[in-house]
């Protein structure tokens, strides 16, 4: 025999309750596929979060994050203190990069340079807190003369000096 | 908005069709159409609502069964009252309204409404 | 069958008097029901919903109180324009549970 709640539609729930008839979704609740018994409650986005899709009666709202903070997780589960470029997000708040590190986003966290040596390159352009360094050609691709390109860095490369 | 149309003189036994067409939104799971009457200096009485989106599940106070259905036409934004073996007492302004989710599900958007006269 | 039943059924009130009426459901209905407002010869008006929540574009004077079987709507200072007839509506869908109360006209002292 055919179950009766699986004639209910998306936005509607089997109830029981009475004589298994597809009642509507009640406010602030949904079911966005059919022959559910119950429906589920809308997801509320408060404080931090804020609503970028409203819930209706077949769809869950959908929040993000209020200016200054960025989603984390599944269906933006948290939000997350947005830190400057050349910064990273630590217990005790943002913190520059360390040297021989940068972060060129206002989230996660502060990376190791790229070492050019170890693909026999040379650096072109010496990194900085916000960005990497920028590997140029293998010193011996120069060709005589070619004034126009960064001298291989010293030994302590990948180069940036203090600030 | 909502404007209801079909309502007229009609003979005691007689049958009448009443549309309710809809613009400016569409009917969905989230708006389901319905019926209300209300008879010269009397109250609102519930006729009964059809689901909103595709499905044809309708909501129907028990005294309509048998005589009173609801259907709807998607492609039109439109929903009927089919009202048969009408009697005298069923003479009364017939509303559309809407039931919105929105709303608890209260009728947050009515048409005028279109007066229906059941007598010989 | 289910019931709703509005009380009283009509009451003289002036200008700037706290009105109340009330609304019993035969049976628990949570927190379902509507209150709307009717003029002569117009469709009614939602003023509240979800018992206690205002629809939009209401004034703030209108309220709406309840659970279960007993709901309240109250105009705590009435206005010329509130002069009308009331109505409560449950909207627990199906069983005939869409019913309307028996309505409250709200006349001139």
């Known amino acids: 025999l055919q179950d009766p709640c699986s004639n209910c539609p998306a936005g509607t729930f089997c109830d029981n309750n009475r004589n298994q008839i597809c009642s509507p979704c009640p406010p602030n609740s949904f079911s966005s596929a059919g022959g559910q018994r119950t429906c589920d409650i809308c997801r509320q986005c408060k404080g931090v979060f804020r609503t970028r899709k409203e819930c209706s009666s077949t769809s869950n709202a959908e929040c993000d994050c209020t200016p200054g903070f960025h989603c984390l997780g599944a269906g933006c589960s948290m939000c997350e203190q947005d830190c400057k470029q050349g910064q990273e997000l630590t217990k005790k708040g943002c913190k520059d990069c360390c040297f021989g590190t940068f972060n060129d986003q206002k989230r996660g966290i502060c990376r190791p340079w790229t070492n050019c040596s170890l693909d026999g390159k040379s650096v072109l352009v010496n990194g900085t807190k916000e960005r990497d360094v920028v590997c140029g050609p293998s010193p011996a691709d120069l060709s005589p003369g070619a004034s126009s390109v960064t001298p291989p860095a010293p030994a302590r490369e990948p180069g940036h000096s203090p600030q | 908005q909502l404007v209801e149309s079909g309502g007229g003189l009609v003979q005691p036994g007689g049958s009448l069709r009443l549309s309710c067409a809809a613009s400016g939104f569409s009917f969905s799971a989230n708006y389901y159409p319905c019926w209300v009457r209300q008879a010269p200096g009397k109250g609102l009485e519930w006729i009964g609502c059809?689901?909103?989106?595709?499905?044809?599940?309708?909501y129907d106070a028990n005294w309509t069964k048998g005589r009173f259905t609801i259907s709807r036409d998607n492609s039109k934004n439109t929903v009927y009252l089919q009202m048969n073996s009408l009697r005298a007492e069923d003479t009364a302004v017939y509303f559309c309204?809407?039931?919105?989710?929105?709303?608890?599900?209260?009728?947050?958007?009515w048409g005028p409404g279109t007066l229906v006269t059941v007598s010989s | 069958d289910f019931q709703l039943t509005q009380s009283p059924s009509s009451l003289s009130a002036s200008v700037g008097d706290r009105v109340t009426i009330t609304c019993q459901a035969s049976?628990?209905?949570?927190?379902?029901l509507a209150w709307y407002q009717q003029k002569p010869g117009k469709p009614p008006k939602l003023l509240i919903y979800s018992a206690s929540t205002l629809a939009s574009g209401v004034p703030s004077r209108f309220s709406g109180s309840g659970s279960g079987t007993d709901f309240t709507l109250t105009i705590s200072s009435l206005q010329p324009e509130d002069f009308a007839t009331y109505y409560c509506q449950s909207t627990y869908y199906g069983n005939d549970g869409n019913a309307f109360g028996t309505g409250t006209k709200v006349t001139v002292k």
């Open positions: 059809i689901y909103g989106g595709s499905s044809d599940i309708t």
């Open positions: 309204a809407r039931s919105a989710w929105y709303s608890g599900w209260g009728g947050d958007l």
């Open positions: 049976q628990s209905i949570s927190n379902r």
